[in-house]
């Protein structure tokens, strides 16, 4: 039975040219995290494997930095970075937990963080 929940940074906005941290946190489970995948729509951005560390997509290696923790830092943001991001936690024995973050990249300087929310 999957008892865990994923808390994410929720709906967030950031300025074009700036950077943003995408964060998810898995709680309420003792399951072991074997791998975390970060995806943007259908594209894999990065993997953090429990044994073998971080791996970044070659398409994003100049703009994506691992961490902090199991999070992901996006740099040199463009308007095209607007969209949904998913953190996919592979765990044993629970299975897979998925968190969703919506990022809006704004032209102006009115960007601010949205509220945190939970996905059961």
């Amino acid at each position: 039975m999957m008892t865990g929940t994923i808390e994410t940074t929720g709906n967030i906005s950031a300025e074009k040219g700036g950077s943003i941290i995408l964060q998810c946190h898995l709680s309420s489970t003792t399951a072991q995290v074997t791998q975390v995948n970060w995806e943007q729509q259908d594209q894999l951005l990065a993997i953090c494997n429990a044994d073998l560390g971080w791996h970044i997509s070659p398409s994003f290696k100049d703009r994506v930095a691992p961490g902090p923790g199991l999070g992901l830092t996006l740099q040199s943001l463009t308007v095209n970075d607007t969209g949904e991001y998913f953190c996919i936690y592979h765990t044993y024995p629970d299975g897979t937990y998925t968190g969703r973050i919506f990022l809006e990249v704004l032209e102006s300087s009115v960007a601010e963080h949205g509220a945190r929310f939970q996905i059961p």
């Epitope: 791998q35 494997n49 791996h55 897979t96």
Partner: antibody
Framework: EVQLVQSGAEVKKPGASVKVSCKAS????????IYWVRQAPGQRLEIIGR????????YYVDKFKNRATITADTSASTAYMELSSLRSEDTAVYFC??????????WGQGTLVTVSS | DIQLTQSPSFLSASVGDRVTITCKGS??????LVWYQQKPGKAPKLLIY???NLQSGIPSRFSGSGSGTEYTLTISSLQPEDFATYFC????????FGQGTKVEIK
Amino acid sequence: EVQLVQSGAEVKKPGASVKVSCKASGYTFTEYSIYWVRQAPGQRLEIIGRIDPKNGRTYYVDKFKNRATITADTSASTAYMELSSLRSEDTAVYFCTRIYGFYFDFWGQGTLVTVSS
Amino acid sequence: DIQLTQSPSFLSASVGDRVTITCKGSQNVNKYLVWYQQKPGKAPKLLIYNTDNLQSGIPSRFSGSGSGTEYTLTISSLQPEDFATYFCYQYNNGFTFGQGTKVEIK
């Protein structure tokens, strides 16, 4: 042309150590991680570990954490894998391979390590 | 980690045959599947990445497809140089390999 050239076959006694080399050419050695993978007779490939030549950071799967040591000499564009306390079940072909993002794009030709008394 | 099972383990075929090899995951592989070819005493060669993307320099007779837990490698018309062992690899959860499929001359 990317090439990974490994050292020759080795025969070792149980309890001994073996060190296999992998010389890279055709690309910037520090830009890609090198993995070591092995294939025992009749078995599937299994990962031993990884090194990032840029910073020397190493990662090992649990099974090999206490026996494998992966190093790199950036001046020689060469990675090494040393396996200690050899036993008969370590008889295998050992490969180095470059990881491109999430998958392995170029491989060495393999080094047969035979452990026999 | 995901376990990959290939079928068949051995396959006898003739030049010109259409050959299909299957790779099944113990969990969803999410299309993060790669195919390699290996000949005795040689380095494995990358054929297809991300389920259906042909690696540069690989002949178009090789193709890949699949989703979820089941993936296939197809050789549309087997050539003499295609007799080899083929194996799959996934990175959706852990980095694991299939046991290989040996394609032999009938």
